[in-house]
């Protein structure tokens, strides 16, 4: 099979790290500096990715694999293969077109990326709020009043914060 395939297409024998060179009668040529081919049978080598600016090099390029980038501190990767770097925000914030903004009341974000999400609605599950939510943390739902049998110690709800749903600053 290999012999048949190579007779049909000599390029199929060119391994990773090489390309099938039309300028050399289709013999396999090693990839030139700062280029790579990660699979066999390639007709060109791809230029190595350069991690510049807000990107930093996580893995150097080689003749058989591309460089891999991540983001400098204060930024995080977005997209396949870290194609973009997005600014980090603090917990309790989300990134908008105007920069990092605090989560609106009733929403939270416990990460440095992503959007603010609504607090869990405990009553939808027939439960009560055990711990109030904050900008950084979701509410903690407790057992429903019906779950507490007579005589069982009930959980005293926390004192309300000055701004409902937020911890005192």
């Amino acid at each position: 099979f290999e012999r048949t395939r190579s007779l049909q297409d000599p390029c199929s024998n060119c391994p990773a790290g090489t390309f099938c060179d039309n300028n050399r009668n289709q013999i396999c040529s090693p990839c030139p500096p700062n280029s790579f081919s990660s699979a066999g049978g390639q007709r060109t080598c791809d230029i190595c990715r350069q991690c510049k600016g807000v990107f930093r090099t996580r893995k150097e390029c080689s003749s058989t694999s591309n460089a891999e980038c991540d983001c400098t501190p204060g930024f995080h990767c977005l997209g396949a293969g870290c194609s973009m770097c997005e600014q980090d925000c603090k917990q309790g914030q989300e990134l908008t077109k105007k920069g990092c903004k605090d989560c609106c009341f009733g929403t939270f974000n416990d990460q440095k990326r992503g959007i603010c999400r609504p607090w869990t609605n405990c009553s939808l599950d027939g439960k009560s709020v055990l711990v109030n939510g904050t900008k950084e943390r979701d509410v903690v739902c407790g057992p429903s009043p019906a779950d507490l049998s007579p005589g069982a110690s009930s959980v005293t709800p926390p004192a309300p914060a000055r701004e409902p749903g937020h911890s005192p600053q």
Partner: nanobody, 111 residues
Amino acid sequence: AVQLVESGGGSVQPGGSLRLSCAASGNIFNIHVSAWYRQAPGKQRELVAWIAWDNVAHYADSAKGRFTISRDNTNKTAYLQMNSLNVEDTAVYYCNSGDIWGQGTQVTVSS
């Protein structure tokens, strides 16, 4: 002019060894890949072993486990140590660096 000059070819019996050398003039070894090719009569020239630009050695399937490529940048010389030679290894062996080719050295394996 930049030149590559091979040496070390010859006749050897099956199972024998040879060490090919490729001496370069000029400054190409610090820039380009070093590679060894071979061409048997009536066949296309094929890549046998090469040191890539990232200084990693690579081998064609036919050379793996038997051939070793190395390079001495100080002496501007590349080497191909060939062990366990068999009749199919008979060919003219060429040194290559970038666009520069050596004149070739004959390797003949026969009993």
